[in-house]
Interface confidence: low
């Protein structure tokens, strides 16, 4: 039989991944009312929209942005000035340096005369008017507009000791997930910042080798499990008064400040109140604190009365963050997700008491994030539809209608291409644009608020689309399996001939951290897209114990325990997939990055003798080497009397003999200030000290994500080369 | 209640000096920005010079072109008081010296104004 | 700098009469404008902040309006106490502080 001439599809190249030929775009809005918003052109232009006149016009020119090379910018909410963000020099995850040039679109010229500082760690508006508040060299600045010389709020900034508005490493990376650490109030009359007093945490320190003659060694403060935390402080300051009477302190509540303690959110409720979150160390009781603005004591008070606490007494508190309030219209109720008594996370509504919460939504599922509560509806996501854990859908509840009506917004909109949703609404929802993620290619669209009408489709992929009609695209399937009780949701990606006859190399990709998900049902052409496409590859991604979405008791499972049953879990698939029958049982590999690099590790080390090679990238190799808020989270503290013994017993490095049997591949960049290059180091030197032959590659410089362009081809051509000299298949 | 009261006036020569008050109560003076403002006979209003802290006991200066490197702008908190040092003054500088008190900490528009002082230059 | 322009030098009007007050800028001053009354012999005396934010006691007939380069300044019924020079002023781009050259209105 010959191949019918109809089929000229090819099949991925690795080099059309390393290119990101087959990259998607998303359509975010930028709202700045009820029916505007801006959004950047493919050209760099800057331009805004109105939803109901149909207007659109430039605002901003590239020309503009070109000439002080700016790659971001954001609009003054008297529409007056335009910041322009330029010299973008990553730092963290989310933190980043840049310098900043304001724009005045009525002169249509720069701000000239107290021009800002360079380079700026935080920037940002107010959300009224055109007041700036930045953080440069740890200290936080105000100018009431951009012309006037900036008014010094904080003096006590100093590199790796204290940080005013914005968080050090721990804070940013296992607390906020933000660059920043203030908060204006929604009149712009006040701002909340913390102060992070990093002077007593152990140093990380790492060199970084550069060009120079002598590498330099950089220093960061980074509290490892067990050792001493920041000492965090909130502040607010009158930005009309600064200094009047200066940065006023909010307090924290007594049975939070008995013990070591975090901050872990700040919400304005309204321009007088303000919403903290804390938590205790041991992270399974969180306190949410309402304060109130005592002018006549010139202070923030924050009653007894006023304090709502969470507690979990099978696990942590909250999903990976605990979650954060949504306050209705009278300041004073509020929407928030947590466990119910079946240990599903569900909306509730708290008026008085968390004890007297009305639960809102519930059912053997998730509710994900509150998007938006207006003065007649709750929006919100869920994994609700059809019982797909890894599916996000968008529902309105009509709270203004009594009794309350459920509508799923998205659920039957693109039924087969869309089911994993985000949302963006303007400030009171008359408008949003959903933005869908999958499984077919994604789509940004527009909708009315009031009859969720689709208005206008924002971005289709179009020209994704028809350069992916000559690609030979894998298969994608979501399943379930089951084994003794527990339901395992897994993808697998099928190679585009799939014959359920033959056999084919397994590679397993793992990640399995606490309170994260693999399979979820989204588009994405990546590495292993290409695996299956080109080298006949199957891949599948298992959601075992300690994943999210599917209740606390699935999720709580890790707890205290970590690296047990995210590996037992992963073998257990491994089976179930070979008793499919498509699975050569001599070609199956794993392999994982970060937490996926630590359950890569252990189970290549189990002893099962099932895989027969693996890779690693930056693995977490011992819990006692990763952060305090992360690691302490998920197995409390490296003490005697607390956890130590599984501390001790859960390290890659434990198990050394044991990768006697299988190819290890170990990969880390020199630079990783997250999962700190001192772990592969340790398993390297365990693996020496047992005489074990393995694989390894440094990348020099490179931090947890090797994402420099140079080294992210170097790495994946490198694990390419390994798995197929592993599976055998023939370059 | 809030009272700015000049005094320091009277007729010099050209290129005298001159050292303008300014007493300040019923406010907390170190929290607002300070202006002198002046007014020529028979003519409209024209900014001189003001002082505003910038936190930490920093403090700005800012003057109209037309009396920088002659004028000097101070204050003492200590006392509440506002000053205004005019060397080398001109013709030109003849007019009533009014003290004003911004609005706000940052806003440098005026909600309270002395009753001024008379300087007049003339040879 | 930013240079302000009033219109009219001088109104006339008769006392219950509607006055409007112009006051243009060569340049934006977005919303940072000020009005002033000065009655002759006497101190100068805010009457309207941010544009059109009345200052304390100052009587409901006084109202501000516009943004960005022209502004307006509107005493709805005039009262014989109105007759007096009125001054705008920008603080939004500064130094210098500017302010107009000021609007007499006269009794008609």
């Known amino acids: 039989l010959r191949p019918s001439r109809g089929n000229t599809k090819r099949a991925l190249t690795l080099k059309d991944i390393l290119n990101g030929t087959f990259s998607y775009k998303t359509y975010f809005p930028n709202w700045i009312s009820e029916q505007e918003y801006l959004h950047q052109s493919e050209d760099d232009n800057i331009v805004f929209y109105n939803i109901e006149t149909r207007e659109s016009y430039i605002i901003l020119s590239n020309s503009t942005m070109k000439s002080v090379n700016a790659t971001d910018y954001g609009l003054s909410p008297d529409r007056q000035f335009v910041y322009l963000e330029s010299d973008y020099s990553k730092l963290w995850r989310y933190s980043y340096t840049a310098t900043y040039y304001i724009y005045d679109l009525q002169n249509g010229e720069f701000v000239r005369g107290y021009e800002l500082p360079r380079p700026i760690q935080y920037l940002c508006w107010s959300p009224v008017g055109s007041k700036l508040a930045y953080v440069y060299q740890n200290n936080i600045y105000l100018k009431q507009r951009p012309g006037d010389p900036p008014f010094q709020i904080t003096y006590t900034g100093r590199e790796n000791r204290i940080f005013n508005g914005i968080p050090d490493w721990v804070y940013e990376e296992e607390m906020l997930a933000t660059k920043y650490a203030l908060w204006w109030s929604p009149d712009g009359k006040f701002l909340a910042y913390v102060e992070f007093n990093d002077s007593d945490i152990p140093i990380i320190a790492y060199s970084y080798y550069g060009d120079g003659q002598y590498p330099r060694t950089i220093n960061i403060p980074y509290p490892k499990a067990g050792a001493k935390n920041p000492v965090v402080r909130v502040f607010i300051v009158d930005t009309t008064y600064p200094h009047h009477v200066g940065p006023m302190e909010v307090p924290v509540p007594e049975m939070i400040a008995s013990s070591d303690y975090y901050f872990s959110w700040l919400t304005w409720v309204s321009s007088e109140r303000v919403c903290l979150q804390w938590l205790k160390r041991v992270q399974n009781v969180s306190v949410l604190s309402i304060c109130d603005f005592r002018e006549d004591w010139h202070a923030w008070e924050c009653p007894k009365n006023q304090e709502h606490v969470e507690e979990s007494r099978t696990g942590w508190a909250g999903g990976f963050f605990v979650s954060t309030p949504a306050f209705s219209q009278d300041a004073t109720s509020y929407y928030k997700i947590f466990s119910d008594k079946d240990g599903y996370k569900h909306i509730h509504y708290i008026k008085d008491t968390v004890e007297n919460a009305i639960q809102i939504t519930s059912g053997k599922w998730e509710a994900i994030y509150i998007f938006r509560v207006t003065q007649d509806s709750l929006f919100y996501s869920s994994n609700e539809f059809e019982g797909y854990p890894g599916r996000r859908n968008i529902y309105r509840i009509s709270i203004g209608n009594s009794p309350p009506s459920k509508k799923c917004v998205t659920c039957h909109l693109r039924k087969e291409r869309c089911q994993y949703y985000t949302a963006s609404f303007s400030y009171k929802a008359k408008y949003y644009a959903l933005v869908c993620y999958g499984p077919g290619l994604p789509i940004s669209t527009l909708h009315d608020g009031r009859t969720d009408q689709e208005i206008q489709v924002l971005e289709e992929n179009k020209e994704l689309e028809n350069s992916l009609r000559n690609i030979q695209l894998p298969k994608v399937e979501i399943k379930k399996l089951k084994d003794g009780g527990l339901t395992f949701w897994y993808k697998m990606i099928l190679p585009p001939q799939f014959d359920r006859s033959k056999k084919y190399p397994l590679l397993i990709q793992v990640y399995g951290g606490p309170c994260s998900q693999s399979v979820k049902s989204v588009f994405a052409v990546n590495w292993i897209t290409y695996l299956a496409s080109k080298e006949g590859i199957v891949i599948a991604l298992v959601d075992g114990r300690g994943t999210a979405f599917q209740g606390d008791k699935f999720l709580h499972a890790v707890y205290r325990k970590l690296g047990v049953y995210e590996v037992e879990d992963q073998l257990t698939a491994v089976r179930k997939f070979i008793e499919m029958g498509f699975i050569d049982e001599e070609r199956i590999a794993i392999w994982g990055w970060s937490y996926g690099g630590y359950v890569s590790s252990l189970a290549l080390a189990s002893g099962t003798g099932l895989f027969k090679c693996g890779i690693a990238v930056a693995p977490v190799s011992s819990w006692e080497y990763y952060a305090s808020i992360y690691s302490e989270r998920f197995m409390g503290l490296p003490t005697k009397d607390d956890n130590l013994e599984h501390y001790k017993n859960s390290t890659v490095m434990a198990r050394a003999e044991y990768f006697r049997n299988v190819d290890y591949l170990l990969i880390h960049g020199t630079a990783d200030d997250n999962v700190h290059f001192q772990n592969s180091a340790q398993i390297a030197k365990a693996l020496v000290n047992a005489q074990v032959d393995f694989q390894a590659m440094w990348y020099s410089d490179q931090n947890h994500g090797i994402s420099s362009g140079r080294s992210q081809n170097h790495l994946y051509t490198h694990m390419t080369h390994f798995l197929k000299q592993c599976f055998s298949l023939s370059d | 209640d809030v009272q700015l009261v000049e005094s320091g006036g009277g007729v010099v020569r050209p290129g005298e000096s001159l050292r303008l008050s300014c007493a300040a109560s019923?406010?907390?003076?170190?929290?607002?920005?300070m202006t002198w403002v002046r007014q020529a006979p028979g003519e409209g209003l024209e900014w001189v010079s003001t002082?505003?802290?910038?936190?930490?006991?920093?403090?700005?200066?800012y003057y109209a072109d037309s009396v920088k490197g002659r004028f000097t702008i101070s204050r003492d908190s200590s006392n509440n008081t506002l000053y205004l040092q005019m060397n080398s003054l001109r013709a030109e500088d003849t007019a009533v010296y009014y003290c004003?008190?911004?609005?706000?900490?940052?806003?440098?528009?005026?909600?309270?104004w002395g009753l001024g002082t008379l300087v007049t230059v003339s040879s | 700098e930013i240079v302000l322009t009033q219109n009219p030098g001088t109104l006339n009007l008769s006392p219950g009469e509607r006055a409007t007050l112009t006051c243009r800028a060569s340049?934006?001053?977005?919303?940072?404008l000020a009005w002033y009354q000065q009655k002759p012999g006497q101190t100068p005396r805010l009457l309207i902040y941010?544009?059109?934010t009345r200052a304390t006691g100052i009587p409901d007939r006084f109202s501000g309006s516009g943004s960005g380069t022209e502004f307006n300044l509107t005493i709805s019924s005039l009262q014989n106490e109105d007759f007096a020079v009125y001054y705008c002023?920008?603080?939004?781009?500064?130094?210098?502080?500017?302010f107009g050259g000021g609007t007499k209105v006269e009794i008609k």
């Open positions: 941010d544009v059109n």
């Open positions: 019923g406010f907390i003076f170190r929290n607002y920005a």
């Open positions: 002023q920008q603080y939004n781009n500064w130094p210098p502080l500017t």
């Open positions: 004003a008190k911004s609005g706000t900490f940052w806003d440098t528009f005026f909600d309270y």
């Open positions: 002082i505003r802290s910038s936190g930490s006991g920093r403090t700005d200066t």
């Open positions: 340049q934006s001053a977005g919303r940072n």
